[in-house]
């Protein structure tokens, strides 16, 4: 993801007693929370790999880039970053790898400048539908988020709740139409089996969508038509067997699109003919010369671009009377 990193400015580390002594009071302008490093020049605070169990209360008001990675946060409650005065400058927040399993409604409220949020590598079993919108109104105040990084947020299989993980994530993305301004959405490595059909239509500003390393089998019910600004669509390392005419036409109609399709188990039978024809003509697929068949066995490792219609046959389906057991 593109979270900003700090400049080479000097970082100050606070003595542990300093933060605890004044945590009940408004933070001093140059104060740095215990177990964190701060650079006022770079407007950056790093609390990294410190096993923090809560978001520090005494974050400096100047913070623009906040790294809270590699901690033991477990839960982000409502208003986890609400402060007096508010953290009005906070633009980039990285919470990756902090063992979060629960993000509650309104967790990111009172962050008026928050543009980049990274929750990757947290087992988010309980992501509130209102985590990003902050309210359960049918139309919420627009979120300032432009980039939302949610790679590898699926809990291990034995730790999931009894509900659709895809549905839970999509509910949070669509609640209150708060994320209409979102330009980058990364959802890689989440074991998604399907993409709910309404999700993309309600994120019209998307420029970059990463769905790589999931388990998507089909895009038949997914519409890309409204995503006129989409520049990159990452679908590598899924379980896609073929792209059908409707999907091909929609992708071809997007003016700025680059599509990445490597490492999918393409089925090279008669249903693949339209996709092969399209691949030969289109410029939108990056690395299209690397796409190869996985099935049927006789076609394994054949390059899609080198196939012709005679190669793409379907075994005839025998009528029941001619089938043998």
């Amino acid at each position: 993801s593109s979270s900003p990193t700090s400049s080479a400015s000097s970082f100050s580390s606070s003595a542990p007693f300093l933060a605890s002594a004044v945590s009940a009071q408004p933070p001093l302008p140059d104060q740095c929370p215990a177990l964190c490093e701060c650079s006022e020049a770079a407007r950056t605070v790093k609390c990294v790999n410190r096993n923090l169990t809560e978001v520090p209360t005494d974050l400096p008001a100047y913070v623009r880039n906040l790294f809270l990675t590699g901690n033991q946060l477990a839960v982000l409650p409502a208003g986890a970053f609400a402060r007096r005065p508010p953290l009005a400058e906070l633009a980039a927040l990285n919470l990756s790898g902090s063992r979060l399993d629960e993000v509650r409604a309104g967790a990111f409220e009172h962050l008026p400048s928050l543009r980049q949020l990274d929750l990757s590598h947290n087992p988010l079993a309980d992501l509130s539908p209102f985590a990003f919108s902050g309210s359960n109104a049918s139309v919420s105040a627009p979120s300032p988020l432009v980039e939302l990084i949610l790679n590898h947020i699926v809990p291990p299989e034995d730790e999931r709740q009894n509900r659709s993980f895809e549905g839970m994530v999509v509910a949070a993305l669509l609640a209150g139409r708060a994320l209409q301004g979102l330009r980058r959405l990364e959802l890689a490595s989440n074991h998604f089996l399907y993409l709910p059909r309404d999700v993309l239509a309600q994120l019209p500003s998307l420029r970059h969508l990463d769905l790589s390393n999931n388990s998507l089998v089909s895009l038949t019910y997914v519409s890309f038509r409204n995503l006129t600004h989409l520049e990159s669509l990452h679908l590598e390392d899924n379980a896609l067997k073929v792209l059908h005419n409707g999907t091909l036409a929609e992708l071809q109609g997007l003016p700025h699109i680059r599509v990445f399709l490597d490492n999918n188990p393409w089925v090279c039978d008669c249903h693949m003919a339209d996709m092969v024809t399209w691949l030969k003509e289109t410029e939108v697929v990056q690395g299209k010369d690397r796409l190869t068949c996985a099935y049927p066995e006789k076609m394994r490792n054949r390059v899609l671009l080198e196939l012709n219609s005679a190669d793409l046959d379907c075994d005839p389906i025998l009528p029941p009377s001619l089938q043998t057991s």
Epitope: T53, A74, S98, R99, L100, D101, P155, Q161
Partner: nanobody, 122 residues
Framework: EVQLVESGGGEVQAGGSLRLSCAAS????????MAWFRQTPGKEREFVAA????????RYAESVKGRFTISRDNAKNTVYLQMSSLRAEDTAVYYC???????????????WGQGTLVTVKP
């Protein structure tokens, strides 16, 4: 309601180790956090450590950091407390607890075991 059963307590010399276990009668899906508390006569129960069932986040009381390790085995519905470098002041009845919050307060936890006694000889 979840039944919690502690085991593994006993007598040990200062500097020694013990491992406590807490077995839950079923996976307490309504309880997201498992914790250990301890109590000595005439004092309130004191938070020792906690772990999340999902994700495995952990937290510790300052007094045990670096000496005690909490862990969980989801397949066995069991939580462990590995205690090393034990001191006389660690002597107490150790209680297992289950709750929703990610907290250190007694009131954050709704289900409790009966306790197991740990005695550390100087």
């Amino acid at each position: 309601e979840v039944q919690l059963v502690e085991s593994g307590g006993g007598e040990v010399q200062a500097g020694g180790s013990l491992r406590l276990s807490c077995a839950a009668s079923r996976r307490p899906f309504s309880s997201k956090t498992m914790a250990w508390f301890r109590q000595t006569p005439g004092k309130e129960r004191e938070f020792v450590a906690a772990v999340r069932w999902i994700g495995g986040a952990t937290r510790y009381a300052e007094s045990v950091k670096g000496r005690f390790t909490i862990s969980r085995d989801n397949a066995k519905n069991t939580v462990y407390l590995q205690m090393s470098s034990l001191r006389a002041e660690d002597t107490a009845v150790y209680y297992c607890a289950a709750g929703q919050a990610w907290g250190t307060k007694f009131t954050d936890y709704s289900d409790w075991g009966q306790g197991t006694l740990v005695t550390v000889k100087p």
